[in-house]
């Protein structure tokens, strides 16, 4: 019987709200197995995909993908899918990244917390158009 | 306990033909595994052969070089085949199968001791 | 094509000594490697998954890292029993399941 993939869920650190220039890091999270991440920005044709996964737990892997230096064009939603052979996964909700003048510095109190339950998160379109697998060596146009 | 056996491995002309199992005991094949094979010439390195998923959609997956002449199929909950064709005297090997599983990230961590292969006129 | 590329061919190192072992993709496979130990009339068993996670029941002293392209084993405090050919192994389905050359390890 063919496994039912858990959808991923997406986080923020430090955070959904960023000071301009200070870095923000996607955390993606999808169960064991997965071989690719894929954090898609808005829509399925902007998107950066790694293979640089760790094992969080012993039933959960993750990617992590780091902006270092925020720009007002980064603001927007944020989603992840991922590959688990030989399947991609369903979109996790989305994420909104927001992008606010630089006042407090990377540390400011008003930071808030990203959270794949968080109150930035949007919930995924339903669609289900076919993902290239990984195999296939798709190009991305990058997020950043 | 789990395990994995190959059986079938023979003495063949060139040219021949050649079909391999691989038998799961402790297991089901109906799991979420990659059934792969490798073989291993005499007093040389591992070569990959290709695996199959032994989930409902059975993907295959093959190296370059086995493309047309090596089939991978599930025939039962329990076995795996290796059809081996045009066989020449580099097939000459130990092959073994194994099982990719995703806590261990595709990486095999459960092999049969493998079955010899020898073509030879 | 991947290859992986892994040095030295053969080594030899004292009991109790530290040893390393290369290997080096020509492809970006990201955490995607293993290792495996062979030993005469064996198959190989599984040492090191996703590039340096210990796979269940393997000893401390094995340890894997990567550094891009390029991964690492380090077996420390060398005993008899580790004496034996170290295979790298891609696991990443787009490039696939290549294996390196082996590494043949003698133990003094």
């Known amino acids: 019987q063919e496994e039912d993939l858990p959808r991923p869920s997406i986080s923020a650190e430090p955070g959904t709200v960023i000071p301009l220039g200070s870095h923000v890091t996607f955390v993606c999270r999808g169960p064991v197995g997965v071989q690719t991440f894929r954090l898609e920005r808005d829509s399925r044709s902007t998107y950066n995909d790694t293979e640089d996964v760790s094992q969080a737990s012993p039933s959960e892997s993750e990617a992590r993908f780091r902006i270092d230096s925020v720009r007002e064009g980064n603001a927007g939603l944020y989603r992840c899918i991922y590959y688990k052979p030989p399947k991609w996964s369903e979109q996790s909700d989305y994420l909104e990244l927001l992008v606010k003048e630089s006042s407090g510095g990377p540390d400011s109190p008003d930071t808030e917390p990203g959270s794949s339950a968080g109150p930035t998160q949007r919930p995924s379109d339903n669609s289900h158009n076919e993902h290239a697998p990984a195999s296939q060596g798709l190009k991305a146009e990058h997020l950043y | 306990e789990q395990s994995l056996e190959e059986s079938g491995g023979d003495l063949v002309k060139p040219e021949g033909s050649l079909t391999l199992t691989c038998t799961a005991s402790?297991?089901?094949?109906?799991?979420?595994?990659?059934i792969c094979w490798v073989r291993q010439t005499p007093g040389k390195g591992l070569e990959w052969i290709g695996c199959?998923?032994?989930?409902?959609?059975?993907?295959t997956y093959y190296a370059s070089w086995a493309k047309g002449r090596f089939t991978i199929s599930k025939t039962s909950s329990t076995t795996v085949t290796l059809q081996m064709t045009s066989l020449t005297a580099a097939d000459t090997a130990t092959y073994f199968c194994a099982r990719g599983a995703d806590y261990v990230y595709w990486s095999y961590g459960l092999w049969g001791p493998g079955t010899l292969v020898t073509i030879s006129s | 094509e991947l290859v992986l590329t892994q040095t030295p061919a053969s080594v030899s190192a004292a009991v109790g000594g530290t040893l390393t072992i290369k290997c080096q993709a020509s492809?970006?496979?990201?955490?995607?490697l293993a290792w495996y130990q062979q030993k005469p009339g064996q198959p190989p068993k599984l040492l090191i998954y996703l590039a340096s996670y210990l796979a269940s029941g393997v000893s401390s002293r094995f340890k894997g890292s990567r550094s891009g392209t390029e991964f690492t084993l380090t077996i420390s405090d060398l005993d008899c029993d580790d004496a034996a050919t170290y295979y790298c192994q891609s696991t990443h389905f787009g490039n696939g399941h290549t294996f390196g050359g082996g590494t043949e390890v003698v133990v003094k």
């Open positions: 492809e970006t496979i990201g955490t995607n």
């Open positions: 402790g297991f089901s094949f109906n799991s979420n595994y990659w």
């Open positions: 199959i998923y032994s989930g409902s959609s059975g993907d």
